[in-house]
């Protein structure tokens, strides 16, 4: 798998989206889970609906929501209040049994806010009731890897 | 501020039919998944509908298979719900509500349905 | 279904009183799927407490949500008068279903 780039600015909010074939995966519920290290497990940080009809409701982990097109075969991930910490590689699964097949290999960069040399105070963050696509979503920059780059810093 | 507004309830005989409508503002709607939930008159909340912000995917309660059909016009930022083979059981205010955190996080007033001859 | 038993059915209190609401599920669901809404006569529902234990926006934190599993509860601490109503609990880890409400009332 290739690993497409993402870039968010810290402070908004970031949305990945991951294609996949509708028919290949119909019937399968998807998650969305982080690289820890280059060889690491992928530890999940939240997965679609239980009932696999209901994909299409949002499913929330703290600032992260996931959302499934089952139809037209595009799996979405939105990175609310995006952080720092947020920054690294992830991964687009669709589950079966046990076993998950990786959809798309993610690498998340955030970028420092423009703004903030501006007092913390100055800055404004939208409640629950409000919706994060109307306050803080920027159009996701996204760019594959190219062949030699590498998404993790070398250990020594 | 998201704002919700139900409109088209009323009286109907057992056996007709009624369409509600679900105005709605203050967010971008084809984004988000709707629902409709009902309240039969002194009693609790029940579950109707879902539907998806782009209206592909629908999904019922048991109770109403068959009988009612979500919908959506995300052009007209709209909500419906066609009602048919109306039953006294059906009698409710019928509310929708929109996805947040949870599934019906923002609702609306509600419009009122009676179903008696 | 999941089924949610909603007790007590009516609790009677005072202004100032703690108050606290049980609901009980017919087979586990996960917290992060579990909402708690206040009714008022011919009023539309309130989310309060979604993800078993998150206050809403605007809510006071008079109101907690906790537990797990089959049993949940929520807790007002000490109750205002704006605070008498009816409470649902909600699970959407499934289909959706919703407890049968308690009705906080005056003492």
């Known amino acids: 798998h290739n690993t497409t780039v993402f870039q968010g600015v810290a402070g908004q909010s970031l949305q990945v989206s991951c294609p996949y074939d509708s028919m290949k995966h119909w019937g399968r519920r998807k998650a969305w889970c982080r690289q820890l290290g280059e060889k690491g497990p992928c530890q999940r940080v939240v997965s679609t609906h239980n009932l696999w009809l209901l994909s299409f409701l949002r499913r929330w982990n703290g600032s992260t929501a996931i959302t499934d097109d089952t139809l037209g075969g595009t799996l979405t991930i939105t990175l609310r209040n995006l952080q720092p910490h947020d920054a690294g590689l992830y991964q687009c699964q669709s589950l079966h049994g046990s076993e998950a097949d990786t959809l798309r290999k993610v690498l998340v960069e955030v970028l420092a806010d423009p703004l903030d040399h501006r007092d913390a105070g100055d800055l404004w963050f939208p409640g629950e009731s409000e919706s994060f696509e109307d306050a803080h979503v920027e159009h996701s920059i996204s760019r594959s890897l190219l062949e030699g780059e590498i998404p993790f810093p070398p250990t020594s | 501020e998201v704002q919700l507004l139900e409109s088209g309830g009323g009286l109907v005989q057992p056996g007709g039919s009624l369409r509600l409508s679900c105005a709605a503002s203050?967010?971008?709607?084809?984004?988000?998944?709707m629902s409709w939930v009902r309240q039969a008159p002194g009693k609790g909340l029940e579950w109707v509908s879902v539907?998806?912000?782009?209206?592909?995917?629908?999904y019922y309660a048991d109770s109403v298979k068959g009988r009612f059909t979500i919908s959506r016009d995300n052009s007209k930022n709209t909500l419906y719900l066609q009602m048919n083979s109306l039953r006294a059981e059906d009698t409710a205010v019928y509310y929708c509500a929109k996805e947040g955190r949870t599934i019906t996080m923002d609702w609306g007033q509600g419009t009122l349905v009676t179903v008696s001859s | 279904e999941i089924v949610l038993t909603q007790s007590p059915g009516t609790l009677s209190l005072s202004p100032g009183e703690r108050a606290t609401l049980s609901c009980r599920a017919s087979?586990?669901?996960?917290?992060?799927?579990l909402a708690w809404y206040q009714q008022k006569p011919g009023q539309a529902p309130r989310l309060l407490i979604y993800?078993?234990?998150s206050r809403a926006t605007g809510i006071p934190d008079r109101f907690s949500g906790s537990g797990s599993g089959t049993d949940f509860t929520l807790t007002i601490s000490r109750l205002e008068p704006e605070d008498f109503a009816v409470y649902y609990c909600?699970?959407?880890?499934?289909?959706?279903?919703f407890g049968g409400g308690t009705k906080v009332e005056i003492k």
């Open positions: 087979q586990s669901v996960s917290s992060s799927y």
């Open positions: 909600q699970q959407d880890d499934r289909s959706p279903t």
């Open positions: 539907i998806s912000g782009s209206g592909g995917s629908t």
């Open positions: 203050g967010f971008t709607f084809s984004s988000y998944a």
């Open positions: 993800g078993a234990s």
